[in-house]
């Protein structure tokens, strides 16, 4: 492979916004390799050497009127200006999350399981995910992947609930996000749809069988009684 | 008080590769970068270009200054080179996986420097290039880098995928595997027994009941026919 030594220069101009643009902090930072050498901090008002390597730059830039003036004005001319340019499609961007619930392991009822609430494709990243069991919030046994940035202006997160599902229980994943006015909810019932249909089929079949058997026996025995007694007199035609 | 938002103009210049980058970052997401070869602004999402504009020439001027500054700093540091920091790699999907439902595999390459990586997608061990996309090098708060690579795919139980990453900080290429984890159905024993028994009993009941009904009806019919002439 290519084993030549590498040398990296990394300038970063950072604008930190608090309460919209009410308070703004501007940082003009310079990194040689991975080490910051010199920076301008609007809270300080002049360039400062971070390491000895940056001392000549701090001294020179502080002496340069244009450079210093520009850095000092940057909270307005650069930060607030750029915020105004991008605000509509960044600060105000809203994408609704897609919520799905599924068990992570295919376990029978009354066995330990992890219920997964998958929340995906949302923006911005601020989100609140809660689990409810039969309407009561579950605070213990929650595990989360944390916020995952997809790199395409969407986020995802998985919030798992450790539980032992019992028949008839209703689990609800509730999601609060700036893109929606009221919370999104997705339910999961402790018995699966296939299990439920199997139970219904079994019980339904059993009941139907009993009905048929009962009806058959009733008709059969009613007619059986008629054989031992007198036959009714036929009507004359 | 924690800040609400951060906008970063991040640049770098790397020698001897002579590679440079200029990008704007909003809360960790790329707004745009400048394609140095094409000398044009590339918006991360196409619609961003409808709301704003950026003169790519300004970025090229910055990169020229960065190149000059790197040479000064390299000399000043007595040619101290960067220490390679190997990446951490994670493969995940864009959304929950469903068979034959289009999805996207994401290869997240994180916490590395210098900003040079070679990334390959493998399907069943063979390189895939169709539909793949990637981000530029994204800045981190610790001044290392992040990068995303994407592969659109159709989930199936037959295919396995790998994201193969090469970096000077790694002794050998790093492979991160992904395959479809088909959920095995629940062993619904109780339900199966109830269903089987219920249907069996039901079927038997229906058959026997039907026989009794038929016999009962026949008997009643026969008795009617035996009335006075």
């Amino acid at each position: 492979g290519d084993t030549r030594p590498r040398f990296l220069w990394q300038p970063k101009r950072e604008c930190h916004f608090f309460n919209g643009t009410e308070r703004v902090r501007f940082l003009d930072r310079y990194f040689y390799n991975q080490e910051e050498s010199v920076r301008f901090d609007s809270d300080v008002g002049e360039f400062r050497a971070v390491t000895e390597l940056g001392r000549p730059d701090a001294e020179y830039w502080n002496s340069q009127k244009d450079i210093l003036e520009q850095a000092r004005a940057a909270v307005d001319t650069y930060c607030r200006h750029n915020y105004g340019v991008v605000e509509s499609f960044t600060v105000q961007r809203r994408v609704q999350p897609k919520v799905t619930v599924y068990p992570s392991k295919t376990q029978p009822l009354q066995h330990h399981n992890l219920l997964v609430c998958s929340v995906s494709g949302f923006y911005p990243g601020s989100i609140e995910v809660r689990w409810f069991l039969n309407g009561q919030e579950e605070k213990a046994g929650m595990v989360s992947t944390g916020l995952i940035q997809n790199g395409d202006w969407t986020f995802q997160t998985l919030v798992m609930l450790e539980t032992v599902p019992r028949s008839g229980e209703v689990y609800t994943c509730q999601v609060e996000h700036p893109s929606v006015t009221s919370p999104l909810t997705v339910e999961w019932r402790a018995r699966s749809e296939s299990a439920q249909s199997k139970m219904l089929s079994g019980v339904g079949g059993f009941v139907l069988g009993l009905l048929f058997l009962g009806a058959g026996l009733f008709i059969y025995f009613r007619n059986q009684k008629g054989h031992s007694g007198l036959q009714p007199t036929g009507f004359l035609s | 008080i924690k800040e609400e938002h951060v906008i970063i103009q991040a640049e770098f210049y790397l020698n001897p590769d002579q590679s440079g980058e200029f990008m704007f970052d909003f809360d960790g997401d790329e707004i745009f970068h400048v394609d140095m070869a094409k000398k044009e602004t590339v918006w991360r999402l196409e619609e961003f270009g409808r709301f704003a504009s950026f003169e790519a020439q300004g970025a090229l001027a910055n990169i020229a200054v960065d190149k000059a500054n790197l040479e000064i700093m390299t000399k000043r540091s007595n040619y101290t080179p960067i220490t390679n920091v190997p990446p951490e790699v994670t493969v995940l999907t864009n959304s929950p996986v469903e068979l034959r439902e289009p999805n996207v595999l994401i290869c997240f390459i994180d916490k590395f420097t210098p900003p040079v990586v070679n990334v390959t997608w493998l399907r069943n061990g063979k390189p895939v290039t169709t539909g793949v996309s990637e981000t530029v090098f994204l800045p981190r708060e610790d001044h290392l880098f992040r990068k995303f690579h994407y592969l659109p795919f159709l989930p199936s139980t037959e295919d396995v995928y790998d994201c193969r990453v090469e970096h000077w900080g790694l002794d050998e290429p790093l492979l991160k595997h992904w395959e479809f984890d088909a959920p095995s159905p629940l062993p619904e024993t109780t339900e199966n027994v109830v269903c089987a028994l219920g249907l069996t009993v039901g079927l038997v009941g229906i058959i026997i009941g039907t026989i009794f009904i038929i016999k009962g009806v026949r008997k009643s019919n026969a008795a009617e026919r035996r009335g006075p002439l």
Partner: antibody, heavy 132, light 107 residues
């Protein structure tokens, strides 16, 4: 029309503090396109810039290295004025002291990309003698 | 600190003459230079900023030129009210510095 009006004693004893104020009319000390300077003139030194104060979202001060250890320039927004304090004076500090507005001309009138400058408004000057 | 050297230190001229004053900087200052006129007992008055931009209200007979280290103030046709001392000042770097002055006297 912008005007600057000086006030302060004309005689200061050595080792004491020289204090001058400059009242602004027709502009604001918090202006976003100006800085407020103190300059002195003496036969031996000629015109000498001492320092300045100005506002750009916060207050900034810049001082000449020759006086940095003993100078303070303060803005007073309530009175729309700014002051000069020069500590530990010596006869060498005897001079005519001027306050002046440095105008930040917009990039459209300058050769360069950002600003260009000129001391476009001056006070009438105050003669300060340091003597016991 | 950047030194500004003005030449000549004094000159004698007549009304209607074309007068040229030079200012040399000890290092490059781009176009960050201003010219002032000062009359005895008065404060300096701004004539030119950014090396060649004429301050509003200043007669057009005054002009400035130059960039880097060499600058010139020209009075195309000297008027009686122009007899004064002229100073250059640099705005490139701190501390801000002035030239030693050029006294324009009546011949």
């Amino acid at each position: 029309q912008v005007q600057l009006q000086h006030s302060g004693p004309g005689l200061v004893k050595p080792s004491q503090t020289l204090s001058l104020t400059c009242a602004i009319s027709g502009d604001s000390v918090s202006s976003n396109s100006a800085s407020w300077n103190w300059i002195r003139q003496s036969p031996s030194r000629g015109l000498e810039w001492l320092g300045r104060t100005y506002y750009r979202s916060k207050w900034y001060n810049d001082y000449a290295v020759s006086v940095k250890s003993r100078i303070v320039i303060n803005p007073d927004t309530s009175k729309n004025q700014f002051s000069l304090q020069l500590n530990s004076v010596t006869p060498e500090d005897t001079a005519v002291y001027y306050c002046a507005r440095e105008n930040f001309y917009g990039s459209e009138t300058c050769h360069k990309k950002y600003y260009c400058y000129g001391m476009d408004v001056w006070g009438q000057g105050t003669t300060v003698t340091v003597s016991s | 600190a950047i030194q500004l050297t003005q030449s000549p230190s004094s000159l004698s001229a007549s009304v209607g003459d074309r007068v040229t004053i030079t200012c040399r900087a000890s290092q490059g200052i781009s176009s960050a230079l201003a010219w002032y006129q000062q009359k005895p007992g008065k404060a300096p008055k701004l004539l030119i900023y950014d090396a060649s931009s004429l301050e509003s209200g200043v007669p057009s007979r005054f002009s400035g030129s130059g960039s880097g280290t060499d600058f010139t103030l020209t009075i195309s046709s000297l008027q009686p009210e122009d007899f004064a001392t002229y100073y250059c000042q640099q705005f490139n770097s701190f501390p801000l510095t002035f030239g030693g002055g050029t006294k324009v006297e009546i011949k």
